[in-house]
């Protein structure tokens, strides 16, 4: 069975989270995609979304979040720049497919942002200093207000978790890895 993994990223204030969500391109290439935060016990909140229909490799910026949908590669790239401690939380990518419920993508991202010198990412790896230059053509897309009540979460596990999803069942099993990926400032 495919496992929905919850990856933990430990970053410093000022750094950039740079992640990707993959999808079945034959089914979802031009579908509208969104980046959501999941607060304990609440419905997921949409922070940014692509245009509808989603445009290929056309960056959409909403505040400090940049989404870039690579239709031809079946990948949604998500960047959160200039991270703040209050950005810490659990995030997910979803695909809007009205009137059906949003389709959740792999993987969920547990982001932990700590104060400190942003030049030193987690782990013992060093990353190059980098200020993202956002293309002037970025646009802001309007996101649907629709959120599925079925995606309300219970308090998710505090550690990284593997979520096994045979059919529609969800089984949580704790694992302990933390991903400290060197991510740019």
């Amino acid at each position: 069975a495919t496992k929905l993994t919850e990856e933990k990223y430990e970053l410093k204030e000022g750094q950039t989270l740079d992640v990707k969500c993959d999808y079945t391109l034959e089914k979802f290439a031009s579908s509208q995609k969104a980046w959501q935060i999941i607060r304990d016990g609440e419905m997921p909140k949409t922070l940014a979304c692509t245009e509808r229909p989603s445009k290929n490799s056309h960056p959409v910026q909403v505040g400090r979040i940049i989404l870039e949908d690579y239709h031809d590669h079946g990948l949604l790239r998500v960047r959160m720049v200039n991270l703040q401690v209050e950005d810490s939380g659990l995030y997910q990518c979803v695909i809007y497919q009205p009137p059906k419920e949003p389709h959740m993508l792999f993987d969920r991202i547990r982001l932990v942002v700590t104060k400190g010198f942003s030049g030193t990412p987690g782990s013992n790896e060093n990353s190059t200093q980098n200020v993202y230059k956002i293309p002037p053509t970025t646009t802001k897309a309007l996101c649907p207000l629709y959120t599925s009540p079925r995606t309300v979460t219970q308090a998710p596990p505090k550690s990284t978790a593997d979520v096994s999803t045979p059919d529609s069942e969800i089984n949580l099993t704790n694992v302990t890895d933390i991903i400290r990926v060197p991510v740019f400032n």
């Epitope: 490799s57 031809d72 590669h73 790239r77 792999f106 991202i109 190059t128 230059k133």
Partner: antibody, heavy 122, light 107 residues
């Protein structure tokens, strides 16, 4: 140890298909992307596409769309790349390479198979 | 697609020499640049990721620098075992693209 072991050399006729395998060991197969890169004799490196072994989702460059199929069998930690409608210019060494974590925008290849030579000749 | 232009395409240097290879991207790649070494008949090997980070186990004579569109790969003191072709690779945008390679030979 941590390695990617590829299947042996193949000789194919134009119009045929070839399926190359890449068996991973020494790490959690489903946590890292598998990429396919090819190299024609005396030429440079050409990225073909990627596979997320966990979700099974794949992406290919425009050049190979419709001709390449990337799959995996997680029970045996093996990824496959099938290229169809072969032509003489597909003669090359095909490499599988481990990418970054499946969720990270980290496209560097820190582990490579030894390569599989595919010769297309009538 | 982002084009990666490497120069020179080949060079010959003496053991102990400082060797410099450049890689130019057709647009800003936000420091998403890696360098690989490929010895004859072998698979490529990652040397440097994200412009300047040395992969574990890679000798410190190899280094990388640059930003924006212009990047440099340096071997501070060329050794006989460094005979190989070196490639840069960008991953700021898909598709991933490699430079054409620089073949390094010993005089």
């Amino acid at each position: 140890q941590v390695q990617l072991v590829q299947s042996g050399a193949e000789v194919k006729k134009p119009g045929a298909s070839v399926k190359v395998s890449c068996k991973a060991s020494g790490y959690t197969f489903t946590r890292y992307d598998i990429n396919w890169v090819r190299q024609a004799t005396g030429q440079g490196l050409e990225w073909m596409g990627w596979l997320n072994p966990n979700s099974g989702n794949t992406g290919q460059t425009q050049k190979f769309r419709g001709r390449v199929t990337m799959t995996r069998d997680t029970s045996i930690n093996t990824a496959y790349m099938e290229l169809s409608s072969l032509r003489s210019e597909d003669t090359a060494v095909y490499y599988c390479a481990r990418g970054g974590y499946t969720s990270a925008w980290r496209w560097y290849f820190d582990l490579w198979g030894r390569g599989t030579l595919v010769t297309v000749s009538s | 697609d982002i084009q990666m232009t490497q120069s020179p395409s080949s060079l010959s240097a003496s053991v102990g020499d400082r060797v410099t290879i450049t890689c130019q991207a057709s647009q800003d790649i936000n420091n998403h640049l890696n360098w690989y070494q490929q010895k004859p008949g072998k698979a490529p090997k990652l040397l440097i990721y994200d412009v300047s980070n040395l992969e574990t186990g890679v000798p410190s004579r190899f280094s990388g620098s640059g930003s924006g569109t212009d990047f440099t790969f340096t071997i501070s003191s060329l050794q006989p075992e460094d005979i190989a072709t070196y490639y840069c690779q960008q991953y700021d945008k898909l598709p991933l693209t490699f430079g054409g390679g620089t073949k390094v030979e010993i005089k």
